[in-house]
């Protein structure tokens, strides 16, 4: 159940896809990745107010219990709902290899 | 890639499964669920320090970028890796029905 997409906190404040530019050094990959030199990392950032993009029944429960016991139960969290693929060219002992990753870049987001 | 299970913050402080007892009223279900009257809600709660139970490459990236830009990029978040099913007996217009939910109770947790 993908619930409401209206953010009660104001535009852009709730869970959504953001892009962060990162170098291989930023990612700690400089010693094992050759290419690409820079990654446009798409990630899920933002608040998850009541029922906003609730991923499933568990997220709805979490919202209810967080309202009741905010010190015990955290609010739902903004995480990837799916991913975009990416190719890295990696250094190996024998030269270079092509490595595909299906879980590297967030494609869209939900709250859970 | 399921990374380290050792919690550097001390026992029980990192991302793990917790059980929270909740009534139908707590969950806002009293008007549509008959049974069970009370649910032992299993959910994922706790901190996600560097590489602790990192769900995938995306979680590892998030850790690196959070270290660099803590005000922009949040730390990974503790969420369900899988779920346990649960049966609810629900009120319907014609009486009652048995409904199975596959996404209600967390089974185990990881950081993402």
């Amino acid at each position: 159940a993908r619930n409401g997409d209206h953010c009660p906190l104001g535009p852009g404040r709730c869970c959504r896809l953001h892009t962060v530019r990162a170098s291989l050094e930023d990612l700690g990959w400089a010693d094992w990745v050759l290419s690409p030199r820079e990654v446009q990392v798409t990630m899920c950032i933002g608040a998850c107010p009541s029922q906003f993009r609730a991923a499933n029944m568990h997220a709805q429960i979490k919202t209810s219990l967080h309202r009741l016991k905010p010190d015990t139960v955290p609010a739902p969290c903004c995480v990837p709902a799916s991913y975009n693929p990416m190719v890295l060219i990696q250094k190996t002992d024998t030269g270079v290899s092509l490595q595909t990753y299906d879980d590297l870049l967030a494609k869209d987001c939900h709250c859970i | 890639a399921r990374n380290g299970d050792h919690c550097p913050l001390g026992p029980g402080r990192c991302c793990r499964l917790h059980t929270v007892r909740a009534s139908l009223e707590d969950l806002g279900w009293a008007d549509w669920v008959l049974s069970p009257r009370e649910v032992q809600v299993t959910m994922c709660i706790g901190a996600c320090p560097s590489q602790f139970r990192a769900a995938n490459m995306h979680a590892q990236i998030k850790t690196s970028l959070h270290r660099l830009k803590p005000d922009t990029v949040p730390a990974p978040c503790c969420v369900p890796a899988s779920y346990n099913p649960m049966v609810l007996i629900q009120k319907t217009d014609t009486g009652v029905s048995l409904q199975t939910y596959d996404d209600l109770l967390a089974k185990d947790c990881h950081c993402i």
Partner: antibody, heavy 118, light 107 residues
Framework: QVQLQQSGPELVKPGASVKLSCKAS????????INWVKQRPGQGLEWIGW????????KYNEKFKGKATLTVDTSSSTAYMELHSLTSEDSAVYFC???????????WGQGTTLTVSS | DIVLTQSPATLSVTPGDRVSLSCRAS??????LHWYQQKSHESPRLLIK???QSISGIPSRFSGSGSGTDFTLSINSVETEDFGMYFC?????????FGGGTKLEIK
């Protein structure tokens, strides 16, 4: 904007070698990888190999090992492909292609036509 | 090596038609499939990356779909400038390979 300017057409004799060039402009040369692609008249595309301009590390399609040698000159922002022991089968258009993401080819040179004939 | 088979080899259409071009891989390549257009005596141009991701500057009438072994490039209303050759390319593993191409021509 990113541009890859390739050298002009070549007519060479069988058994000889030839060195094709691809000069990059509009970006930092070491920021993009260079690939070389072969296209015979009326046919499809064949990937020859990849080179990492920062330090010249390269990867070849097994089919072109011994046939092609890829090099770079970072001082002139130029990539080179030398083709050896030429036969009529090597007559083709050769493209250099720049890749930011190594998965696909974003920027292409205009192609160099190589004709091998006695 | 991964073999990419494109079909049909030639497609004759009228401007305004919706067309679908197929690319089939000899083994699963997830989403690691990219599409190019090449007009006569020109260099190829990237149209779609990673099966379905759009490219800046490419008209929105071009779209891609598929995963695994079966992929489709769709043009929802063909324009005269769209005629030419279309190639798919995989980046799941080295060596990168291309399909044999589909020629889109005016009926």
């Amino acid at each position: 904007q990113v541009q890859l300017q390739q050298s002009g057409p070549e007519l060479v004799k069988p058994g000889a070698s030839v060195k094709l060039s691809c000069k990059a402009s509009g970006y930092t040369f070491t920021s993009y990888d260079i690939n070389w692609v072969k296209q015979r008249p009326g046919q499809g595309l064949e990937w020859i190999g990849w080179i990492y301009p920062r330090d010249g590390i390269s990867k070849y399609n097994e089919k072109f090992k011994g046939k092609a040698t890829l090099t770079v000159d970072t001082s002139s922002s130029t990539a080179y492909m030398e083709l050896h022991s030429l036969t009529s089968e090597d007559s083709a258009v050769y493209f250099c292609a720049g890749t930011y993401d190594p998965a696909y080819f974003d920027y292409w040179g205009q192609g160099t036509t190589l004709t091998v004939s006695s | 090596d991964i073999v990419l088979t494109q079909s049909p080899a030639t497609l004759s259409v009228t401007p305004g038609d919706r067309v679908s071009l197929s690319c089939r891989a000899s083994q699963s390549i997830s989403y690691y499939l990219h599409w190019y257009q090449q007009k006569s005596h020109e260099s190829p141009r990237l149209l779609i990356k990673y099966a379905s991701q759009s490219i800046s500057g490419i008209p929105s009438r071009f779209s891609g779909s598929g995963s695994g072994t079966d992929f489709t490039l769709s043009i929802n209303s063909v324009e005269t400038e769209d005629f030419g050759m279309y190639f798919c390319q995989q980046s799941n593993s080295w060596p990168y390979t291309f399909g044999g191409g589909t020629k889109l021509e005016i009926k």
